[in-house]
Interface confidence: low
């Protein structure tokens, strides 16, 4: 009405979806009696009576607000519960006396969207596309009002850029009145974007202020042509025979081209294709010196049929040849001398060592070992080790057995064995010499012989303990072309209950096992007893 005072701006009340809005009627006592008020909702300039206050008592009007309204604060405030987006409108209270006045409240409703869901284009993007292609889609569900989306690449916001970056956003209204925002990022990507991290950010407002939510970061498969192929060898550094060596063909394109690896034939100088898998990996396992040579890789793009060649790479598989020792099977008399010579070839400088096989003691650093005034004890194994000091683990060895002519030599001359009558004994006897001796026993039983090394033999005998055996004892005799030698095993009766625990006999290199004759599959290891005091 002309001349009437301009309506004041409505009071702003901000609430989140699902919470309770408190609509305080701001009429002063002079403007109206709060015990007699009508409340209206205004939608599209149409007023609808929703609540009456009479004598301080409230009554909802039938309709959409009927179940959600109640009076608070002695009638001055109308509480609206379970606020929905549809409640975003103007509410007004109208006092009836002394004259009709009204007070307007603008209700603003907010709802944070769910965490943004980002989906990358799984098929990837070629770098040479003529126009921006779909990189990823960002969906923010159930927000109110519509959130704003910002796309980021490597932490920097993306702006619309003609023919480069296009952001296509749309929104749908759910039945709840909430908005779901979908934003599609389209971009022209370059090769450097293969590792780029993309994410989207939703900006939205709540009564508490401005907020934002970020999606996870994603990378998009980027397809770009190969410009260069090259070879990579693993492991890096010096290679040696026996290593697992992988020669890998690599390319700077995606998808990689079809690879083939060739090696130059040293005699024809022609490149010959090696058998690789489709990943372009040539596995040399175990690597041999023959694998050394000049390798190159060819990458063939099966779409364009463009072929690229790598720089050739020299591969050196370091080796030590078989070690040769001369003489190969030396035989010497006691008191004589012997010179052992070791030879080997290698791709690198070699170091030689001579070791005593039985003890591991280093006897000589160098290819020649000289042994003087040989004794029987000098017989046995000598090992030459040829190694490359610059490449740990690269070595070859050769064992040579030095035979000192001599008659059999017994591991023990005499031995006492405690037994019980009717037990089955397991006796052993060891002898060495050159030529290697054979062993015989003076009693009947089951004997077996094992060659321990070229000069040493071990014989085992299973025998039943009888009174006659106790009387005679047991002898083992070793013989070769140069003589005979005997070991004697004295058998002594003992009661098994007097055996001391954990006192296994380990005298010499022989063992004896007693078992009841009646239980052939049961054995009990012989125990060593303290000497009786009466024994001298």
């Amino acid at each position: 009405v002309p001349g009437e005072a301009e309506q004041p701006a409505p009071e702003l009340v901000e609430v989140e979806v699902g919470s309770t809005a408190l609509l305080k009627c701001g009429l002063s006592q002079s403007q109206g009696n709060l015990s007699h008020v009508d409340w209206f909702s205004v939608h599209k300039e149409k007023r609808t009576l929703i609540f009456r206050v009479r004598q301080g008592q409230g009554q909802s009007e039938p309709g959409e607000y009927e179940q959600r309204l109640s009076l608070q604060d002695r009638g001055a405030t109308l509480a609206l519960t379970q606020v929905t987006p549809q409640d975003e409108r103007i509410f007004l209270c109208q006092g009836k006396r002394p004259r009709s006045q009204e007070y307007r409240i603008q209700l603003r409703v907010y709802k944070a969207p769910e965490e943004p869901n980002i989906q990358v284009n799984p098929l990837g993007i070629p770098v040479n596309s003529k126009e921006p292609e779909e990189v990823a889609t960002c969906v923010g569900r159930n927000g109110y009002p519509i959130p704003q989306v910002i796309w980021y690449k490597n932490g920097r916001p993306l702006k619309e850029e003609k023919n480069r970056v296009h952001i296509q956003s749309s929104q749908t209204v759910e039945s709840s009145g909430l908005y779901t925002l979908q934003s599609i990022l389209k971009a022209q990507l370059v090769k450097e974007d293969k590792d780029a991290q993309f994410y989207c950010e939703l900006n939205y407002r709540l009564p508490s202020g401005n907020h934002m939510k970020e999606s996870r970061e994603v990378t998009v498969p980027v397809f770009y042509p190969t410009e260069k192929v090259w070879l990579e060898v693993e492991p890096v550094g010096m290679l040696k025979e026996g290593d697992r060596v992988e020669i890998r063909c690599l390319a700077d394109g995606n998808p990689p081209p079809h690879f083939s690896i060739s090696k130059q034939n040293p005699s024809t100088r022609e490149a010959e294709e090696e058998t690789t898998n489709d990943n372009g990996v040539l596995v040399l396992e175990p690597a041999r010196k023959e694998h050394s040579g000049r390798y190159e890789c060819q990458g063939l793009d099966l779409d364009t049929m463009i072929s690229l060649l790598s720089e050739p790479q020299e591969l050196l598989v370091n080796y030590v040849s078989d070690v040769r020792v001369s003489p190969a099977a030396p035989e010497r008399q006691e008191g004589s001398s012997l010179t052992l010579t070791c030879e080997a070839e290698s791709s690198q400088d070699l170091e030689f060592q001579w070791l005593r096989e039985e003890t591991g003691q280093v006897l000589e650093r160098g290819p020649v070992l000289q042994l003087h005034d040989l004794k029987r004890e000098a017989g046995g194994g000598y090992r030459c080790v040829a190694s490359v000091p610059s490449i740990p683990g690269l070595n070859r060895t050769q064992l040579v057995n030095v035979a000192i002519f001599g008659p059999p030599w017994m591991a023990f001359k005499e031995r006492k064995v405690w037994v019980k009558e009717n037990m089955v004994l397991n006796l052993s006897c060891e002898a060495s010499g050159h030529p290697r001796p054979t062993i015989s026993w003076n009693v009947n039983g089951t004997a077996s012989e094992q060659d321990q090394d070229p000069q040493r033999v071990l014989s085992t005998l299973n025998v039943l303990v009888t009174p006659e055996l106790l009387e005679t004892g047991v002898e083992c005799t070793a013989s070769n072309d140069l003589g005979k030698n005997t070991s004697i095993l004295f058998l002594e009766l003992v009661n098994l209950t007097t055996l001391t625990p954990d006192s296994n006999t380990t005298t010499g290199l022989s063992t004896s096992t007693a078992s009841p004759h009646t239980r052939a599959n049961s054995t009990s290891t012989e125990r060593k007893l303290p000497e009786p005091e009466s024994r001298g």
Epitope: S260, D278, D303, T304
Partner: antibody, heavy 119, light 109 residues
Amino acid sequence: EVQLVESGGSLVQPGGSLRLSCEASGFTFSSYAMSWVRQAPGKGLEWVSIISGSGGSTSYADSVKGRFTISRDSSKNMLYLQMNSLRAEDTAVYYCARDKYGYNPFDYWGQGTLVTVSS
Amino acid sequence: FMLTQDPAVSVALGQTVRITCQGDSLRSYYASWYQQKPGQSPVLVIYGKNNRPSGIPDRFSGSSSGNTASLTITGAQAEDEADYYCNSRDSSGNHPLYVFGTGTKLTVL
């Protein structure tokens, strides 16, 4: 929208020939390798052949090598399979499928076309 | 070269089921998995390490160990009843060759 539509399937006598076609749309045809895959009635899938995006490189399953020829015409967005010396065991639904080497084997398939070899 | 699958597998509605595929080539390549319903073309459901094309529900997942690939459906639905095929590239030769598994018929009870 990516679409692959096969045609050319029919009833043919053993020893006869047939040419299948596959019309592609909705993507840059020459950027993708294409394959033919077949499925005999009531049986599983069997890969038949592949051709590179340029058409310069092809490969075949042992069962069809020497009898079938795969080709393409990128100007027409067409893929072909020339089938000669047909046998009863070639009876199948033939699918064309989009293939991307080293990334995504068969991401889109046609609806298939039925080839029946019978006397 | 061959890829071997169980001919038939059944699962109760809402339960988890795993379909396996075995073959030497799976030591070098990941399997791709396809779903085929009667009278329809196959549909790619899993490829690469464990990737789903858009439109494939997240109840489908893939995994691989040694020479065995697996397709897992967590919370199987009635609409998942179909034939499932694995597929891999040959790892032995230089020419690209592909092979499909023998197929597994999935029944949702």
